[in-house]
Interface confidence: low
């Protein structure tokens, strides 16, 4: 044991130090005192600390701890906050482009529908955006509303244009006929399936990122218990009471204290690991019809095909609907007019060819890789904090909470603490209520993520057989059903450099005219320009 340093006969250094924490010297003894009222820095001899000083040290220690914790989580917090914002904005851009593609398709192929179609398309994609952000909207209802709204316009503008104004009150009948007669074939059901799958996954992805932020924010702003404050004070400040201003705590001692203080927080570790791994599974399954980018950007083509389907059956439909909706009171009898011989196009829809150069998919995978480097974040916190606060290297000539020691011994330190308070008790108290709440939220999101990802991402599948798909049709299990039929197959050149062009918007009025094909230009859409990445931190 090294000899103790000569005591500071005047408490001058302690006074000088303490004045920085608390202006005024009224609490600091001028010379060492017995310190019998001390509760944390229990003196082995005369001390330069008072009870009031102890209280100030405890406050300061807890503040330091809170700031260390915030510092520890800063990089992780920034990563998730930035990505949540970037993905949310990128998804909005996908929606905006999808809307513009669809509007361009109407403008180029069905200009007589455009004023109203633009309105319905706008409402549909607004609902898509709201759904992604968590709004309580039913995807099937969104799709039904789109086609319910479109059909009366198609009928009055394209199928029976000569209707007098007085016949416009047949809109309700036409909306009903749209469903009963399945005038768009199975395309609405196909869109429902694709859109609901891709949007549900997108929505849960954003929810998971936002919960990640909440987890970090919760642990970032934890208020540490008084017991923890006492342990921290003993570790960081009690040495000053003995005039040992330059002595640093032993590293091993710091680890013991941090494990005590952080016991509740470290309980998050198991659920945090599961969160990152579940998020990775979800991301791995986000392709084809589980990728909203892929689905929404091909939607204009499927809608075009659905209108072509109406077109092919227009003759029979006009006759049937003419009878059905001639007087709106006949509406209740409409099922009697169900046409048995509508033309059913059983040609297999071709896949919209997607060239992935740099898509949201690669961004998602990049985020997961970065998040995985933080998989041990919570279990590593005590060690991180010790390595980022003043500790003695190699545990030599360091402070063990009671005295300056040549070498730290965990056993001796624990024994020395027994009469002051029990570390074990501190650990056994269980996590703070806020930590328990965040663990419950993590459990819930992990359950949701697992549900979405397993088995093989097919949990969301619905059986569409009863809807009339036959072999050769585009059934639900065929992930490829994204758009383009016959010779009008769409080639989507998907160079999504979203982060480079967050302000970019396709103006429908600029779309080149082409009344024959589904696509605005030469059977190919490539409105995404490589403008270079603006948001380089994600690279």
């Amino acid at each position: 044991q090294p000899p103790p340093p000569p005591p500071d006969a005047t408490c001058h250094q302690v006074r000088s130090f303490f004045q920085r924490l608390q202006p005024g010297l009224k609490w600091v003894p001028e010379t060492p005192v017995p310190g019998s009222d001390l509760q944390v820095c229990l003196p082995k001899g005369p001390t330069c600390c008072s009870r009031k000083m102890e209280e100030k040290y405890q406050l300061t220690a807890r503040l330091n701890m809170e700031q260390l914790l915030q510092s520890a989580s800063m990089e992780l917090k920034f990563l998730i906050i930035q990505n949540a914002a970037v993905f949310q904005e990128a998804f909005e851009i996908v929606v905006r482009h999808a809307k513009n593609y669809t509007n361009a398709m109407f403008k180029n192929n069905y200009p007589s529908l455009t004023p109203q179609a633009f309105e319905f398309v706008g409402e549909f994609f607004t609902d898509v955006s709201l759904y992604i952000l968590g709004s309580d909207i039913n995807v099937d209802d969104m799709v039904n509303e789109l086609f319910d709204s479109l059909f009366p316009v198609i009928y009055t503008q394209l199928m029976n244009p000569g209707l007098p104004d007085s016949a416009l009150d047949i809109n309700e009948c036409l909306r009903g006929a749209r469903r009963d007669l399945k005038v768009f074939g199975n395309f609405p059901k196909l869109i429902m399936t694709q859109v609901s799958k891709s949007l549900q996954v997108t929505r849960i992805f954003l929810q998971a990122l936002n919960l990640g932020i909440e987890v970090i924010n919760t642990t970032d702003h934890l208020k540490f218990s008084k017991d923890c404050g006492r342990m921290l004070t003993r570790m960081w400040y009690c040495s000053y009471c003995q005039g040992l201003m330059m002595v640093k705590p032993c590293g091993g001692y710091c680890n013991v204290v941090m494990q005590g203080c952080m016991a509740g927080v470290v309980e998050i570790d198991k659920y945090w690991r599961e969160y990152i791994l579940s998020l990775e599974e979800l991301v791995n399954g986000m392709y084809r019809i589980y990728d909203m980018e892929n689905v929404l950007l091909g939607l204009f083509s499927t809608i075009h095909d659905s209108i072509q389907y109406v077109q092919k059956n227009a003759g029979k439909l006009t006759t049937t609907i003419g009878k059905l909706c001639a007087h709106s009171q006949q509406r209740q009898y409409r099922s009697a007019y169900y046409p048995e011989d509508l033309f059913i196009d059983k040609k297999v829809l071709k896949v919209a060819h997607v060239e992935h150069e740099e898509t949201l998919s690669s961004r998602r995978r990049e985020l997961i890789q970065k998040l995985k480097s933080f998989i041990s974040f919570y279990s590593a916190l005590p060690g991180y904090i010790c390595s980022h606060s003043p500790v003695a290297e190699n545990d030599t000539l360091c402070w063990n909470g009671q005295e300056l020691v040549e070498r730290y011994s965990q056993k001796a330190a624990r024994n020395g603490m027994k009469n002051q308070f029990n570390l074990h008790e501190l650990k056994m108290k269980g996590p703070e209520p806020v930590v328990s709440q965040i663990i419950d939220k993590l459990k819930h999101i992990n359950q949701l993520l697992r549900t979405m990802s397993m088995p093989k991402g097919r949990v969301l599948d619905k059986n569409l057989d009863e809807e009339g798909f036959e072999s050769g049709d585009c059934g639900d299990d065929e992930d490829e059903c994204i758009g383009g039929s016959g010779d009008g197959m769409i080639k989507v050149k998907n160079q999504l450099r979203f982060l480079a062009e967050l302000a970019y918007d396709l103006d429908v009025d600029d779309a080149p005219g082409n009344s024959q094909q589904a696509t605005p230009k030469d059977n190919e859409i490539s409105t995404f320009h490589n403008l270079g990445n603006v948001h380089s931190p994600l690279k």
Epitope: L21, L63, N64, L68, S71, M74, P390
Partner: nanobody, 124 residues
Framework: QVQLQESGGGLVQAGGSLRLSCAAS????????MGWFRQAPGKEREFVAA????????YYADSVKGRFTISRDNAKNTVYLQMNSLKPEDTAVYYC?????????????????WGQGTQVTVSS
């Protein structure tokens, strides 16, 4: 190992201004508190100002409050001390220091890395 390099010192007339800079390298600058200290000839080194890791909190010695402003640019790994209304008693060697504490403490024992110092001379 952390390196701190001060610059911006010099000779200035009373009432004038100077801006000191301290460029840091060697560890994640944005995680750590930073401070400025000064030492006049024949006197002990004293605290001048400190700033927390995020820049959200600043602290000043009473003698410089209202005249000096500490700031940081985490993107540039640099901390600054803007000194206005300088007085002859501000003459000293000014040291930049980096602390393991994110808060930017006020006492030099809580700083573990120091720059070489830059001379500030205020003439009357």
């Amino acid at each position: 190992q952390v390196q701190l390099q001060e610059s911006g010192g010099g000779l200035v007339q009373a009432g004038g201004s100077l801006r000191l800079s301290c460029a840091a390298s060697g560890r994640t600058f944005s995680s750590y508190g930073m401070g400025w200290f000064r030492q006049a000839p024949g006197k002990e080194r004293e605290f001048v100002a400190a700033i927390s890791w995020s820049g959200g909190s600043t602290y000043y010695a009473d003698s410089v409050k209202g005249r000096f402003t500490i700031s940081r640019d985490n993107a540039k790994n640099t901390v600054y001390l803007q000194m206005n209304s300088l007085k002859p008693e501000d003459t000293a060697v000014y040291y930049c220091a980096s602390s393991a504490w994110p808060a930017g403490p006020k006492h030099q024992v809580e700083y573990d890395y120091w720059g070489q110092g830059t001379q500030v001379t205020v003439s009357s």
